[in-house]
């Protein structure tokens, strides 16, 4: 019994005066607490308590469940205890089978003994299975068996408390350990699509997948820069132990333009947090935006190829595409394809392949595209660069020499005079008149230029050269002059191709 100095309050004394007492089942438990300031007896087993205000605790017929710690407390709050074992061969263990362990922490298997004199108090696996090799435990007959540093691998471990009694192994009821994993990484989050484009009134639905070791992971959909509560629905699965998946689906049944923005799926556990975002754009109606990939004014040399290429954004999907020239629709020579195979792709490419273009094939080429909401078009003005062609070269009745040339770009006509037998005509002659004539062909056809000089200026035999040229090439025509007396005659004009 405790002893204290005189004058100080002393703890109560208990009879019988021992720390442990063993009684047989059916026998009487009689405990006396002596203290002038007696307050109460408290009985505790498996962390449950009962109180008694009588200073003598009497249990006439002891049962195994009367095993436990009996504590007498006085008015000064001082106490004294005795532990009573009620030996019952038919009930060697008192149990509370709730058994949870936090990974890396200790946990108590609550199976206190009713008989402290049994031996080999330990844990055993169910159905004769061995315990994990690294499982360490510390037995305490009054509390149970403490498993040290619970491992994740112990989850759903089935075990019994065990003792040897009279040479036989006796097992308690079965315990199943439920391990709560420690979070050792942030949750893994992913989203069904990174961006959404909708028309007003359409349903917006996006799913976030959260993966972690347990369902204790927290997740939510948040709208960036907003505190508005979002409506979510959940599905969850345990793919075996410590492999938990949750799908959080956010739905806006009828999206409005002002619902546009960034939505974040956020998840956290005690280790940290992770998030992923998706962008919603809601438009009041569909659209088509066309972007030419080349200049809409195109110059191409005669006989060469050119590709007219557009990219366009279309939402909803494009339904009709066509290329048109001179009110005629191309049935081939063009292709249309999505810019990417991504499910949320709204960008497309259309290419018209023009091959070996002739001078007569210049003009406006138009790409038209439509969807259920809008139509859009873009025009390319194609100019075919052609070497000048001399259409006419004549001596007119009024004595003028006239040269008419066609080509694109607009040809320039220069005149040269070659006296006598000289091969090279270098002396230039200024024209009297130069006119650009209206072509009867399409507006993108060749340009016709007419130039005239006065032949009376020539006093000697020789050759007059009319040279038409542009960026593409040049062509010449010649007038030969011979004088007979005072008369000048034009003898056979001829052209000479000059590359």
């Amino acid at each position: 019994q405790p002893s204290v100095s005189p004058g100080e309050p002393s703890p109560p004394s208990i009879h019988p005066g021992k720390s442990d007492l063993i009684v047989r089942v059916g026998d009487e438990i009689r405990l006396l607490c002596t203290d002038p300031g007696f307050v109460k007896w408290t009985f505790e087993i498996l962390d449950e308590t009962n109180e008694n205000k009588q200073n003598e605790w009497i249990t006439e017929k002891a049962e195994a469940t009367n095993t436990g710690k009996y504590t007498c407390t006085n008015k000064h709050g001082l106490s004294n205890s005795i532990y009573v074992f009620v030996r019952d061969p038919a009930k060697l263990f008192l149990v509370d089978r709730s058994l949870y362990g936090k990974e890396d922490n200790d946990t108590l298997v609550r199976c206190p003994l009713t008989d402290p004199e049994v031996t080999n108090y330990s844990l055993k696996g169910c159905q004769g299975k061995p315990l994990p090799k690294d499982l360490r435990f510390i037995p305490d007959p009054k509390a149970g068996i403490m498993i040290k540093s619970v491992k994740r691998a112990y989850h759903r471990l089935c075990l019994h408390c065990s003792v040897d009694q009279e040479g036989k192994s006796v097992l308690s009821e079965k315990f199943i350990l439920k391990v709560r994993p420690a979070f050792k990484a942030v949750p893994v989050v992913s989203v069904s699509k990174a961006s959404y484009l909708l028309r007003e009134g359409e349903e917006f639905t996006v799913t976030c997948t959260i993966k972690d070791v347990s369902s204790s992971v927290y997740s939510t959909w948040k709208r960036e820069n907003s505190q508005t509560k979002l409506q979510e629905k959940y599905n969850s699965w345990h793919h075996g132990d410590f492999n938990y998946e949750r799908q959080a689906t956010l739905t806006i049944s009828s999206a409005r333009v002002n619902d546009s923005g960034v939505f974040m799926c956020y998840a956290n556990n005690t280790f940290g947090s992770a998030n992923v975002t998706t962008t919603l754009e809601v438009v009041d109606k569909g659209f088509i935006n066309i972007f030419p990939m080349i200049n809409t004014t195109v110059f191409v040399n005669d006989g060469e190829n050119v590709d007219l290429i557009v990219e366009y954004e279309a939402f909803p999907k494009p339904e009709h595409q066509q290329w048109i020239y001179m009110n005629r629709t191309f049935t081939d020579k063009w292709e249309d394809y999505p810019k990417s195979e991504n499910e949320s792709n709204i960008r497309y490419v259309s290419e018209l392949h023009l091959t070996r273009l002739k001078g007569t094939e210049g003009g406006t080429y138009t790409f038209l595209v439509s969807n259920s909401d809008v139509n859009a078009a873009i025009a390319f003005n194609v100019y075919v660069n052609t070497k000048p062609e001399i259409l006419t070269y004549d001596r007119l009745v009024n004595g003028m020499l006239q040269c008419v040339a066609a080509g694109f770009p607009e040809p320039t006509i220069d005149w040269y005079f070659c006296p006598g037998t000289e091969q090279r005509c270098s002396a230039s002659v200024l024209p009297v008149d130069v006119q650009t004539l209206n072509s009867s062909g399409p507006p993108f056809g060749k340009l016709v230029v007419q130039s005239s000089i006065d032949s009376s200026a020539f006093k000697h035999n020789g050759t007059v050269e009319c040279k038409a040229y542009n960026d593409v090439g040049k062509t010449s025509a010649y007038f030969n002059f011979a004088f007979k007396g005072n008369n000048k005659e034009q003898i056979h004009p001829h052209t000479l191709f000059t590359p």
């Epitope: 505790e44 962390d47 449950e48 308590t49 009962n50 149990v95 509370d96 089978r97 709730s98 949870y100 936090k102 922490n105 946990t107 169910c126 159905q127 759903r156 089935c158 079965k174 199943i176 709560r180 347990s214 369902s215 204790s216 345990h238 005690t270």
Partner: antibody, heavy 117, light 111 residues
């Protein structure tokens, strides 16, 4: 003997928070898990979550996602359940329940929370 | 989550009748042959009261006319001879894995 005594009825406005208490006696408070269960009028029982014995870590039903917090005060052997951003759907009787030997062996008497504008 | 479906949802019976309520789980609630299924009784305005734990164990203080059976996904609560005080709502509950779930309830009424 084990007893769980809960705080009295509450009337709250939508958007407000409520904190229900559950005072335990008759056992070592820190040795047992405490669960919270609610029951809407005329409806069934719904598990909200648990605060585990020992270290006091929690596990919540995802349905209450971030709106619920369960805590304990070991000095007074009291468990608390706070629910935020209340709506009319949160009108219910809220129960605390002690887990003993794998089952909910002891229940509080319940706390009616009414959410009304 | 594990979904528990009780049948019937309501039931009319007379004093002395034998009554059976079933609870079906969407997946097994067993671990090593132990069924983490429990039955509760609830009367209007009162907290639920535990009747049967771990599928077939009678809670201390509960009359022996109550019994439970089953394993895996199919469970039964039986009242062998109905007494007037047994008219109440009965719930099954699983705690094999979180979130713990309850059946929707079976209301037992006097015929």
């Amino acid at each position: 003997q084990v007893q769980l005594v809960q705080s009295g009825a509450e009337v709250k406005k939508p958007g407000a928070s409520v904190k229900v208490s559950c005072k335990a006696s008759g056992y070592t408070f820190t040795s047992y898990n405490m669960h919270w269960v609610r029951q809407a009028p005329g409806q069934g029982l719904e598990w909200m979550g648990v605060i585990y014995s020992g270290q006091g870590d929690t596990s919540y039903n995802q349905k209450f996602k971030g709106r619920v917090t369960m805590t304990t005060d070991t000095s007074t052997s009291t468990a608390y359940m706070e629910l935020r951003s209340l709506t009319s759907d949160d009108t219910a009787v809220y129960y605390c329940a002690r887990e003993r030997d794998t089952r909910f062996g002891n229940w509080g008497q319940g706390t009616l929370v009414t959410v009304s504008a | 989550e594990i979904v528990l479906t009780q049948s019937p949802s309501s039931l009319s019976a007379s004093v002395g009748d034998r009554v059976t309520i079933t609870c079906r789980a969407s997946e097994s609630v067993d671990i090593y042959g132990e069924s983490f299924m429990h039955w509760y009784q609830q009367k209007p305005g009162k907290a639920p009261k535990l009747l049967i734990y771990l599928a077939s164990n009678l809670e201390s203080g509960v009359p022996s006319r109550f019994s439970g059976s089953g394993s895996g996904t199919d469970f039964t609560l039986t009242i062998s001879s109905l007494q007037p005080e047994d008219f109440a709502t009965y719930y099954c509950q699983q705690n094999r894995e979180e979130p713990y779930t309850f059946g929707q309830g079976t209301k037992l009424e006097i015929k």
